[in-house]
């Protein structure tokens, strides 16, 4: 399925690109999937379509939903879906996992942190950068074009980095923020922090009601002795053993170590006889060691039994 997850904060600009690509000369029509209502192209609207792009200037929580884009050429149509979620601004400093873009790793030699999605926006330098909500100060930090460079990277530089910039549309300015985690690699080039390879962050797993389903939480841990290295599942923030649902169990899967000292662990979550209420739960894959904790969240969605394309 040509579907893409996009997210943003209320009262900020959000620009989404159609997951189906086409030549610039092709027309692209956008619809709000729930109502099949066409998205206008006039720029005076708060939400409008501009070719491959769908613009929320600014975004509102009520804009959340699935948007359909149809790329039309003289010989074919291609359909894509943008799953947009707009969240309320957090009052505290914490950036929740669901607002995080992909984690990047750096080492002493290479420590660029790119500002996610910035290429979609009409912005001008300089970018503002924050670490764990604190504005970055000091000569070690250099904002350059669309990325941050950190000189003489240390383990303590790991954390959540937020870029803030202004999008300009017809003379009006809109704020945009985006956050991603930065991890510091060891000399072998692998993160000292746990790295989760599966599931993907915010993955939607399709399941059939009444059938069994398996979810695998798989992570690798950096070189060296791992006194504490664990991979586990949580349901709605609760350990499986404490959740008290006998249909849902976790068991250790494949463990493997590699020639560079990397150790990887799997934990399989088995759900027997999937029920409707299972779709309402939040499934968290957790990987932790002495350097920190990583969490990837999965949700289940109902698979149409006759849908053989997914």
């Amino acid at each position: 399925k040509f579907s893409k997850q996009s997210w943003g904060l209320e009262n900020e600009a959000l620009i989404v690109r159609c997951p189906r690509q086409g030549k610039p000369s092709y027309t692209v029509d956008w619809y709000y999937s729930q109502t099949n209502k066409s998205i206008p192209t006039q720029e005076r609207n708060r939400v409008f379509a501009s070719g491959q792009l769908l613009k929320f200037l600014p975004a509102a929580v009520a804009d959340s939903g699935i948007y359909t884009c149809i790329v039309r050429s003289p010989t074919f149509n291609r359909t894509g879906y943008a799953n947009v979620t707009i969240y309320k601004k957090q009052s505290d400093c914490n950036v929740p996992d669901y607002l995080m873009y992909s984690t990047v790793s750096g080492s002493e030699k290479n420590s660029k942190i790119y500002c996610p999605t910035i290429d979609l926006y009409n912005w001008t330098a300089p970018l503002e950068w924050f670490k764990n909500c604190q504005a970055l100060q000091g000569s070690r930090y250099r904002a350059h074009k669309s990325f941050l460079v950190i000189d003489n990277v240390m383990t303590e530089d790991a954390g959540d980095y937020t870029c803030k910039f202004i999008h300009n549309e017809n003379g009006a300015n809109y704020s945009v923020t985006a956050t991603r985690s930065f991890t510091v690699k060891d000399e072998q080039g692998f993160s000292l922090f746990p790295v989760i390879g599966a599931p993907a962050q915010n993955e939607i797993k399709e399941v059939e009601i009444g059938k069994n389903a398996n979810l695998t939480c798989s992570a690798c841990f950096g070189k060296g002795t791992q006194f504490l290295a664990a991979v586990l599942w949580q349901l709605n923030g609760t350990k499986i053993t404490d959740f008290g649902e006998p249909r849902i169990q976790q068991e250790e899967g494949q463990n493997q170590s590699f020639s560079n000292g990397l150790a990887c662990l799997d934990m399989v979550l088995r759900i027997a006889d999937v029920k409707e209420e299972d779709l309402l739960l939040q499934y968290d894959c957790l990987a932790l060691n002495l350097h920190g904790l990583r969490r990837h969240t999965v949700r289940l969605s109902r698979k149409n039994p006759i849908d053989h394309h997914s």
Epitope: S102, T103, G189, V195, G197, A198, A200, T216, S218, C220, G253, Q254, Q256, F258, L262, C264, D266
Partner: nanobody, 118 residues
């Protein structure tokens, strides 16, 4: 995949895996092997940065490489042992975070059989 077959212990084989239909700048490709009744075991992986990782059992005998122009992944296997006998699979994922762990991979080839006799 192609390049599998039968070989005497100590011999060599080169496996190839031709990928089509992807144009991703960030990716991870891997080789895995499976013997009857056992799970898939990670042999080697390579990502879009060229970083390689090998299973502990490889011990310098195998080399993973790619030819970007041909969209082809290779596994050069030297000093083969009878215990290397297995079905070998190539796999891919659209992310440069990379390790040869089967659960990380989305796209799988059909497999090619390698048999090493003593």
């Amino acid at each position: 995949e192609s390049g599998g077959g039968s070989v005497q212990a100590g011999g060599s084989l080169r496996l190839s895996c031709a990928a089509s239909g992807y144009t991703y700048s960030r990716y991870c490709m891997g080789w895995f092997r499976q013997t009857p009744g056992k799970g898939r075991e990670g042999v080697a992986s390579i990502n879009s940065d060229g970083t390689t990782i090998y299973g502990n059992f490889v011990k310098g005998r195998f080399t993973i490489s790619e030819d970007n122009a041909k969209n082809t992944l290779y596994l050069q296997m030297n000093s083969l042992k009878p215990e290397d006998t297995a079905m070998y699979y190539c796999a891919a994922r659209v992310d440069s975070t990379c390790a040869p762990m089967p659960s990380w991979f989305t796209y799988w080839g059909q497999g090619t059989q390698v048999t090493v006799s003593s």
